[in-house]
Interface confidence: low
């Protein structure tokens, strides 16, 4: 039951966070025009990973789109490209963690084969939310740099002159949005990485004779038997041995529900 | 190509007046601010007027022209204007126009300057 529920708000947690990566990639704010000390704004300026906006003070506004790759930050293209890296990751992630999903039956699909999926989905949504902090935090190391040598501008210009003209960009929500999300993301991923361990079946082989107490009479056959040690669903003494006379390989092959140790 | 171009200098008596424009030009798609400077001979270029939004707690003067000078912008013709007058033969110089620009080309709005016009005030 906890590692259902541990599984499935990972799954919701990461679906937020993606959800979220997907906004701030999308969102136009990811730096403001900052206003303070700054007496000659014609109009407020926003941009976004994908276009540039500008806000009169009549209250219109107009956005372009950058038609040009030679003009951007090559740290811009850099962003560009984590994000989308990140909503490509945690898609896939999310494909494949909604057929792991505990709840969900597929077919006759084995304990083991979800586990691995919420694994392998739990690893991706972790570098998901990795790189949307990583290329958020980029685009915000790339503002404070150019905030602090505008700065220097505006009060260093040519002989000594004041630089009025000079635009300095603060962090815009987009950039918030992105931190949270792609927290999120990564929560949701080491959530489903921990399921995992709980789905996962685990099972000792006893080479020797293996005993196993059912009710009042004792099962015994050598080399057929699977040790439990009560943690696993085998809490009401049911018999683990089906009787089949198999060999050890096939019996790692094919694990059950009942093989925890 | 961004280009800044400055119109409406020339010769002028003291107690007169003239009227500078400053267009700009090429594939500017804001503006975050203007500005005119000048320059008189043998001197540092220095601000005298600054323009943002239009409206009156919007602009910024020198004390050498608070009262004489008027800063206006048009912004849907991305022109700057700058009404002198009561000039005085100080008021002699080379006048640059300054606008902050963002352009299809750039992520940041970056300052651009003109050329300059001549005003020279004789008394």
């Known amino acids: 039951m906890a590692v259902t529920a541990c599984q499935g708000l990972g799954f919701v947690v990461s679906l937020i966070g993606i959800a979220g990566i997907i906004a701030a990639t999308c969102m136009d704010q990811w730096s403001t025009q900052d206003l303070y000390n700054n007496p000659v704004t014609a109009v407020f300026n926003y941009q976004g990973l994908w276009r540039s906006c500008v806000r009169e003070s009549s209250g219109f506004t107009e956005c372009r789109g950058y038609f040009t790759l030679l003009g951007l930050p090559a740290m811009l293209q850099a962003v560009r490209a984590l994000m989308i890296v990140g909503i490509v990751l945690g898609a896939i992630g999310l494909l494949v963690s909604i057929f792991a999903l505990k709840c969900i039956r597929i077919g006759s699909m084995e304990d083991s084969a979800k586990a691995n999926m919420t694994l392998t989905s739990g690893i991706m949504f972790i570098v998901s939310g990795l790189c949307a902090i990583a290329g958020v935090s980029v685009f915000a190391n790339m503002l404070v740099t150019n905030f602090w040598m505008s700065t220097a501008n505006m009060y260093t210009g040519m002989g000594g002159m004041v630089q009025t003209v000079q635009t300095r960009y603060t962090f815009g929500a987009a950039l918030f949005v992105g931190w949270v999300a792609g927290g999120l993301t990564l929560i949701g991923g080491v959530m489903m990485c921990i399921a995992c361990r709980g789905l996962a079946p685990e099972e000792t082989n006893y080479k020797a004779v293996s005993y196993h107490a059912s009710g009042h009479s004792v099962a015994y056959k050598p080399g057929g038997f699977k040790a439990s040690t009560g943690f696993g669903s085998n809490t009401k003494n049911k018999k683990i041995y089906d009787g089949g006379a198999r060999t050890e390989d096939e019996v790692q092959s094919y694990p059950s529900k009942h093989d925890y140790v | 190509q961004v280009k800044l171009e400055e119109s409406g200098g020339g010769f002028v008596q003291a107690g007169g007046s003239l009227r500078l424009s400053c267009s700009a030009s090429g594939s500017i798609f804001g503006i975050t601010g203007m500005a005119w400077y000048r320059q008189a001979p043998g001197k540092e270029r220095e601000l005298i007027a600054a323009i943002g939004s239009g409206s009156a707690g919007n602009t910024k003067y020198a004390e050498s022209v608070k009262g004489r000078f008027t800063i206006f912008g048009d912004y849907a013709k991305k022109t700057l204007y700058l009404q002198m007058n009561s000039l005085k033969p100080e008021d002699t110089g080379v006048y640059y126009c300054?606008?902050?620009?963002?352009?299809?080309?750039?992520?940041?709005?970056?300052?651009?300057w003109g050329l300059g016009t001549q005003v020279t005030v004789s008394a």
């Open positions: 300054n606008a902050g620009l963002m352009t299809s080309q750039s992520y940041y709005s970056k300052p651009y």
